[in-house]
Interface confidence: medium
Amino acid sequence: GALEVQVPEDPVVALVGTDATLCCSFSPEPGFSLAQLNLIWQLTDTKQLVHSFAEGQDQGSAYANRTALFPDLLAQGNASLRLQRVRVADEGSFTCFVSIRDFGSAAVSLQVAAPYSKPSMTLEPNKDLRPGDTVTITCSSYQGYPEAEVFWQDGQGVPLTGNVTTSQMANEQGLFDVHSILRVVLGANGTYSCLVRNPVLQQDAHSSVTITPQRSPTGAVEVQVPEDPVVALVGTDATLRCSFSPEPGFSLAQLNLIWQLTDTKQLVHSFTEGRDQGSAYANRTALFPDLLAQGNASLRLQRVRVADEGSFTCFVSIRDFGSAAVSLQVAAPYSKPSMTLEPNKDLRPGDTVTITCSSYRGYPEAEVFWQDGQGVPLTGNVTTSQMANEQGLFDVHSVLRVVLGANGTYSCLVRNPVLQQDAHGSVTITGQPMTFPPEA
């Protein structure tokens, strides 16, 4: 009969750092022997080989030595794959391909997950608050995967959707730190709750803050944007937040929304006559049409480039009108510095050497700091140059000229002033005579 390969329909969910089993089974015919079996596990999209069994033998892992079959169960038709120490990068579809005389395959999805920490809450300003004051409440939760869903609500459980800015930044392991900012005009008093949900684990992490201001509210309808610049990494998408307070009975037919570059007044995107007029900015912008009626005039800017940096004006007119400008700050992390030494052999105390620290493709221009092994800054005889490429990203080369002591460690720190990201490199020169790199 025909060979049938079966895998679970639902994704296999695995916590980062644990082991996962990707189930796959087939129905062996009577008289089947493992010598007849050719089993291939591969990544569905890239077709990268993961593990295989052929000619009656396990051919081993081709995937970072973290996979294994269940050899004692193969003859019964169990072709499952064990994946050890699961990483975020493992997420995706794995194809189990079984051939004997006939053949078949099926793909199983691996969904990686990591729980988020209990959120911490901060308030700015955090004293002398009065009704009508605008406050910024920040909710931060760490080391989760996949990206979280963040929900804000007031003391009555009513969702707060306007003026929320959520950023999620992945670390080297692919785990996300979530920072969600709620800007709110204070009422007489209020409780504000933040819930960070892991959509895969259905795990909720909660925190709340209660604010009791000093007197009754005052305030006016206005167009609101974040005070702080929106920071966006090159190549990612950015949301330029803008909101207005629609009056009762407001309809989109009444709205005229214009986004433009503040300085040049170049049109970026518009909405008029109840219709999105589209992007006038390299087809990389979009509104949130379903949210406009609630007063959300935010703009999505896709595939951010260095050249996008600057001020964008959100202009809203209904019967009255208003506008506000939001700044976009573009950033790109610097690479880990590479260190070179000249001369790099037969070095002796008293020799003058040139140590070059190079870091690439960052933005904006870096701050470069040198220090010795004791952490003492080295400021003399440092020359730093930064050259922008066609995309506007900077390559940094910093040269330190130093007279060698008996031994010494020289560290270079390249700081991205916007991301507050530090990239370090160091070189240790010891012995007499000395060479670089040190010989094994």
Partner: antibody, heavy 120, light 107 residues
Framework: QVQLQQSGGGLVQPGGSLKLSSCAAS????????MSWVRQTPDKRLELVAT????????YYSDSVKGRFTISRDNAKNTLYLQMSSLKSEDTAMYYC????????????WGQGTTLTVSS | DIVMTQSPSSLSASLGDRVTISCRAS?????LNWYQQKPDGTVKLLIY???RLHSGVPSRFSGSGSGTDYSLTISNLEQEDIATYFC??????????FGGGTKLEIK
């Protein structure tokens, strides 16, 4: 003995469609084997166009035909089919059906071939 | 997809000669098969999994190789061996790929 008898083919205009051939199988348990369509272009190169497993649950296509060609089988009739649409001149070829043998991934029996010409 | 490089593209030999055709690819783990196509278009499997003779194929045909380099040898060329020969890799999933062919003629 194993036999694969092809029919179909012919002349089709660019952009046109054709349910090329059927391939009628005999001499073996049809539903137990994968089947394939292999074509030979005028420059005599062979290209595996599409493959289907025994119960029809898995299909595979070359990038050059993906989205345009559909391989199917009727195990009750012991017949293999290839539906072709949006035909291009580069689809002009001799089309062979072949039995695909599993674990070593070879084609152990071939049909006699049928010619498809895509031309205006 | 894996690219199969077959050589030579054509070759002329005398009856009784020993003939060798080569096929090169990335590492295909011995999943290399050889086919014969007669001038009338008929295609037959000769060898599968590098060196295993398909049933009914004369023993003068043999295959060898490993890793990236494989070859088909006809030890004692006969008139009926006049044909074009193709290699094919069966590594990983379909679509499997063929070499460009070697046309064998009699001197």
């Amino acid at each position: 003995q194993v036999q694969l008898q092809q029919s179909g083919g012919g002349l089709v205009q660019p952009g046109g469609s054709l349910k090329l051939s059927s391939c009628a199988a005999s001499g073996f348990t049809f539903s137990s084997y994968g089947m394939s369509w292999v074509r030979q272009t005028p420059d005599k190169r062979l290209e595996l166009v599409a493959t289907i497993n025994g119960n029809g649950g898995n299909t595979y296509y070359s990038d050059s035909v993906k989205g345009r060609f559909t391989i199917s089988r009727d195990n009750a009739k012991n017949t293999l089919y290839l539906q072709m649409s949006s035909l291009k001149s580069e689809d002009t070829a001799m089309y062979y059906c072949a039995r695909s043998y599993g674990n070593y991934h070879y084609f152990d029996y071939w049909g006699q071939g049928t010619t498809l010409t895509v031309s205006s | 997809d894996i690219v199969m490089t077959q050589s030579p593209s054509s070759l002329s030999a005398s009856l009784g000669d020993r003939v060798t055709i080569s096929c090169r690819a990335s590492d295909i783990r011995n999943y290399l098969n050889w086919y014969q196509q007669k001038p009338d278009g008929t295609v037959k499997l000769l060898i599968y999994y590098t060196s295993r003779l398909h049933s009914g194929v004369p023993s003068r045909f043999s295959g060898s190789g490993s890793g990236t380099d494989y070859s088909l040898t006809i030890s004692n060329l006969e008139q009926e061996d006049i044909a074009t020969y193709f290699c094919q890799q069966g590594n990983t999933l379909p679509p499997w790929t063929f070499g460009g062919g070697t046309k064998l003629e009699i001197k």
